[in-house]
Interface confidence: low
């Protein structure tokens, strides 16, 4: 069967289409090329006469047609009009005629496009941006592409207008970036120039460093001031309340207590419009801004309740500092039998009664630190019964109870014989 | 993330020399134009110099003509601003930035000291 295959299918304009024929029939009279898809006189490009190897141009004919002795056609510098259908009419020496359609379709060659914008200078959380990918071509497809990869999924970016526009809404800094759009046909495929998104912003809260709060008098004290902004911000320090100056560092040598006070940064954004403040408070004194743990010495860790007392002792080595004591998360002295001595430094318990066992701890501070130290166990026991909780029957001690003796008397066996002993001395 | 990183500035005698480095990243310096905008205290933000490396197209300021070059290395993704003869009025915060063939300047870098002083 006669059949006409286009070489290529789909033409840049400007270059050239071979309409190639397969299965021409033997013993031809000749054949005509028509535009269209059907055989009308008015439309005939070529025609050929084999015997005479004649080529007749018809209507049609353009000039830029070339036809070749197999009946292929060649059409050169084609144009955006020779999209479509084409017909072969061959005749045969018998003059019984066969024909064939074929096409092909036409797409310019693509510009380099230009991304159009907008709004060059869009603010953070507030404007949104249109790209437009210049300039508009039929039949074109249109991509866009971010840091030279592909768009992100994101509910703030939109693709309208064919996919020629990319909305970005409420832009956040991180849209600032590199942006191009390609457009593609059948034919050919162009990316444009970068465009580099611009989104102002700021400023952040300040920060101010160093993070000390402390100094001593004599000390440098410089401060630094930085917030995120674009473009950047201008800063200016006030003291208590009153302006310094508008920089972003604040240098003030040889420091005294005069200097304490609250500082602040003042981060401006002209371009947003926007301003930012941080206050940090600086407080120049002699007193430690670290005291040190203190540690807690025991004239005994192990007493002997109703005889026995017992001296704590809180150390450090910090200056200017006060000291307290805690007993299970209690404030001491709890009672007359507790003294506190050397400016609280000792605690003296005299004597030591059972409810005093437990854990204790001291606490060294200053008007602007404190620190505990670990706490030490003090444990309480009874060697001796008293009276009242014994009986004698046939020189045989008992125990009666009462007083809360019972809680101890499992661990206080040894004890309990030592107190029989005594009690059998004693009568 | 667009971003651009300044170098190099510092503390110079006039008549001395400073070379200010900008790192780009997030995109090509080769499909743009890069520039150098000063900001001083009490003065009004100067566009010093730019180049668009697309196009090999240079400006630069009346202020600094034949004492100042801008350069880029594409293959560093950088662009460079060599100061020679420096004076006290150049004293600023230089800033890296974005610009285009008009002179326009968008995206910062967040700076570097230039301090001229004898």
């Known amino acids: 069967k006669l059949t006409i295959e286009s070489t290529p299918f789909n033409v840049a304009e400007g270059k050239e289409v071979l309409l190639l024929v397969h299965n021409l029939p033997q013993h031809l009279f000749g054949y005509s090329w028509y535009k269209g898809e059907r055989v009308d006189g008015n439309r005939q490009i070529i025609g050929y006469v084999i015997g005479t190897q004649q080529a007749t141009p018809g209507p049609a004919y353009s000039g830029r047609e070339i036809i070749y002795p197999n009946a292929s056609l060649l059409i050169q510098n084609i144009i955006q009009n020779d999209t479509g259908f084409y017909t072969l009419h061959v005749i045969k020496s018998d003059l019984v005629n066969e024909e064939a359609t074929g096409q092909f379709r036409v797409y310019p060659e693509l510009p380099k496009p230009s991304i159009s914008s907008n709004n060059s200078k869009p603010v953070e959380d507030k404007d949104a941006v249109a790209f437009t990918c210049e300039p508009e071509t039929q039949d074109a497809t249109y991509l866009w592409w971010v840091n030279n990869q592909s768009l992100p999924v994101s509910p703030r970016l939109q693709l309208s207008n064919g996919n020629r526009t990319l909305t970005l809404f409420n832009v956040t800094r991180n849209d600032s970036a590199s942006y191009k759009c390609e457009t593609q046909n059948p034919v050919s495929a162009r990316r444009s120039d970068s465009v580099i998104l611009n989104v102002l912003y700021g400023p952040d809260t300040p920060t101010i460093s160093p993070s000390d709060t402390y100094y001593r008098p004599g000390a440098n004290l410089s401060l630094s001031c930085y917030a995120a902004s674009n473009p950047p911000a201008q800063y200016s320090w006030l003291i208590n309340g009153t302006f310094q100056q508008s920089t972003q560092e604040l240098f003030i040598p040889n420091i005294t207590v005069n200097n304490s006070g609250s500082y602040t940064c003042h981060a401006n954004n002209s371009v947003t419009g926007c301003n930012r403040t941080t206050v940090k408070t600086i407080i120049v004194t002699e007193l430690s801004p670290v005291v040190a743990k203190p540690q807690i010495k025991a004239s005994k860790t192990t007493v002997t309740g109703d005889k026995d007392s017992v001296n704590l002792t809180c150390s450090t080595n910090d200056t200017g500092i006060s000291i307290r004591w805690f007993f299970k998360n209690q404030s001491l002295p709890s009672s007359e039998r507790m003294k506190l001595s050397q400016g609280n430094i000792t605690l003296s318990i005299n004597p030591v009664k059972r409810e005093d066992a437990g854990t204790y701890w001291c606490e060294v501070f200053n008007p602007i630190s404190k620190n505990q130290s670990d706490p030490i166990m003090l444990n309480v026991n009874y060697n001796a019964l008293p009276q009242e909780n014994l009986i004698n029957v046939d020189e045989q001690l008992y125990f009666q109870g009462g007083s809360g003796l019972n809680d101890i008397f499992e661990a206080q066996k040894i004890e309990w014989h030592e107190a029989r002993a005594h009690h059998h001395h004693h009568h | 993330e667009v971003q651009l990183v300044e170098s190099g500035g510092g503390l110079v005698q006039p008549g001395g020399s400073l070379r200010l480095s900008c790192a780009a990243s997030?995109?090509?310096?080769?499909?743009?134009?890069i520039g150098w905008v000063r900001r001083a205290p009490g003065k009004e933000e100067e566009l010093v110099a730019s180049?668009?490396?697309?196009?090999?197209?240079?400006r630069y300021a009346d202020s600094v003509k034949g004492r100042f070059t801008i350069s880029a290395d594409t293959s560093k993704n950088t662009a460079y601003l060599q100061m020679n003869s420096l004076r006290a009025e150049d004293t600023a915060v230089y800033y890296c930035?974005?610009?285009?063939?008009?002179?326009?300047?968008?995206?910062w870098g967040q700076g570097t000291t230039v301090t001229v002083s004898s």
């Open positions: 997030g995109f090509n310096i080769k499909d743009t134009c």
């Open positions: 930035a974005i610009t285009s063939h008009h002179g326009d300047y968008n995206y």
């Open positions: 180049i668009c490396q697309y196009s090999g197209y240079t």
